[in-house]
């Protein structure tokens, strides 16, 4: 189970993980105390048949070719959490592990 | 965390889970002893902004709008295994739980 890593200079057209730093302050998300920014990454690229398919199911749906099923798309296949300190809606400061904030791997599903 | 369920008569255009029975015999996958067919389901539909987004990350990437990032796509967000009996490449009969064969929920990611 692997995925491609690319950067802004890459010529790769296939599904790939690209670096992206999310800046909460720039978004005006002022309820987030920390981190103010973090490396989130994102997925982009084409999903040719079978390339980086995460699930056997993806292949089976392609074979069955039901009405309206699009081809697989380039999407996160492995994600990880980050620890965040933030204000909730009750003015309380909350510390918690927020799941699925970082893309570790991209694939076609 | 929920997802829409549709069928072939639905007029829903948004990301939805549709029924799909996979027939291994029809595919010519004769190394599979059992099941010969099973309910796999599949995902199809449009991902309007924020609708059924599985991860906060999806929203953040939309905000950051990096080069080449497509919008979220309708993809499995919860899957389950099935038990299968099959021949492996060494002519042995194997019984095992095969992960991610059934789509339980669809979402935008």
């Amino acid at each position: 189970d692997f995925g491609l890593d690319c950067d802004e200079h890459s010529t790769e057209s296939r599904c790939c993980r690209y670096p992206l730093t999310v800046d909460f302050e720039a978004f005006g998300w002022d309820w987030i105390i920390a981190p103010k920014r973090y490396k989130a990454n994102y997925c982009s690229g084409e999903c040719e048949f079978v390339f980086l398919q995460k699930y056997p199911h993806t292949h089976l749906v392609h074979q069955a070719n039901p009405r309206g099923s699009a081809g697989p798309c380039c999407t996160p296949t492995k994600m990880s959490p980050i620890n965040m300190l933030y204000f909730n809606g009750k003015e309380q400061i909350i510390y918690g592990k927020i799941p699925a904030m970082v893309v570790d791997r991209c694939g076609c599903s | 965390d929920f997802g829409l369920d549709c069928d072939e008569h639905s007029t829903e255009s948004r990301c939805c889970r549709y029924p799909l029975t996979v027939d291994f015999e029809a595919f010519g996958w004769d190394w599979i002893i059992a099941p010969k067919r099973y309910k796999a389901n599949y995902c199809s539909g449009e991902c309007e902004f924020v609708f059924l987004q599985k991860y906060p990350h999806t929203h953040l990437v939309h905000q950051a709008n990096p080069r080449g990032s497509a919008g979220p796509c309708c993809t499995p967000t919860k899957m389950s295994p099935i038990n299968m009996l099959y021949f492996n490449g060494k002519e042995q009969i194997i019984y095992g739980k095969i992960p991610a064969m059934v789509v339980d929920r669809c979402g935008c990611s």
């Epitope: 002022d30 309820w31 105390i33 103010k36 620890n83 300190l85 204000f87 003015e91 400061i93 510390y95 | -």
Partner: antibody
């Protein structure tokens, strides 16, 4: 960019009064509790007072309770600290803060005869 | 009311050396709400580490935090000239904030 700018500091005699202001920008001011923190010359940081987002509840350290009053005007994005019965030991740089992350640069209050 | 005691009061070290700063709470506190700041003369305090061990974005990774219960530590693995400052631990409970007395890290 979040900015907290304190004003109103200065020299005052013991027993006198002073009102500090803190103008907030770049922050949804009305959504958050705000605090005053001070630092006396050569001493450490001391939390002084806090106020809820609506201004409905206020909190004070024992050293200032009964003498200082914290308030806010959300329409003006401004936090206040009314200081009465000032003592020499109240001499400090007073910081306005949305703890723990956003702080102003501070305003100096000197209590001396 | 929680009291935070920092030690030593002053730490005299040379650039390149390791600094270990202690913060002890009078009773057990939540590690989620124990933070560290750096303060320099004429500047507002700056949040360095949040929730005991998480580095704030932009803070060099030579800074690290650890601890639980009543004992917490800030470590600077190799002191740089810009690291000489006063460091404070701070605890949050409800709307009350408690600061430690500070540790001054000075050039030897």
């Amino acid at each position: 960019e979040v900015q907290l700018v304190e004003s109103g500091g200065g020299l005052v005699q013991p027993g006198g009064s002073l009102r500090l202001s803190c103008a907030a920008s770049g922050l949804t001011f009305s959504r958050y509790p705000m605090s005053w923190v001070r630092q006396a010359p050569g001493k450490g940081l001391e939390w002084v007072s806090a106020i809820t987002s609506s201004g409905g509840s206020t909190y004070y350290s024992d050293t200032v309770k009964g003498r200082f009053t914290i308030s806010r005007d959300n329409a003006k994005n401004t936090l206040y600290l009314q200081m009465n019965s000032l003592r020499a030991e109240d001499t400090a740089v007073y910081y306005c803060a949305r703890l723990p992350d956003y702080w102003g640069q501070g305003t100096l209050v000197t209590v001396s005869s | 009311e929680i009291v935070l005691t920092q030690s030593p009061g002053t730490l005299s070290l040379s650039p390149g050396e390791r600094a270990t700063l202690s913060c002890r709470a009078s009773s057990s506190v939540s590690s989620s709400y124990l933070h560290w700041y750096a303060a320099k003369p004429g500047q507002a305090p700056r949040l360095l580490i949040y929730s005991t061990s998480n580095l704030v974005a932009g803070i060099p990774d030579r800074f690290s935090g650890s601890g639980s219960g009543t004992d917490f530590t800030l470590t600077i693995s190799r002191l740089e000239p810009e690291d000489f400052a006063v460091y404070y631990c701070q605890h949050y409970s409800g709307y009350h904030f408690t600061f430690g007395g500070g540790t001054k890290v000075e050039i030897k």
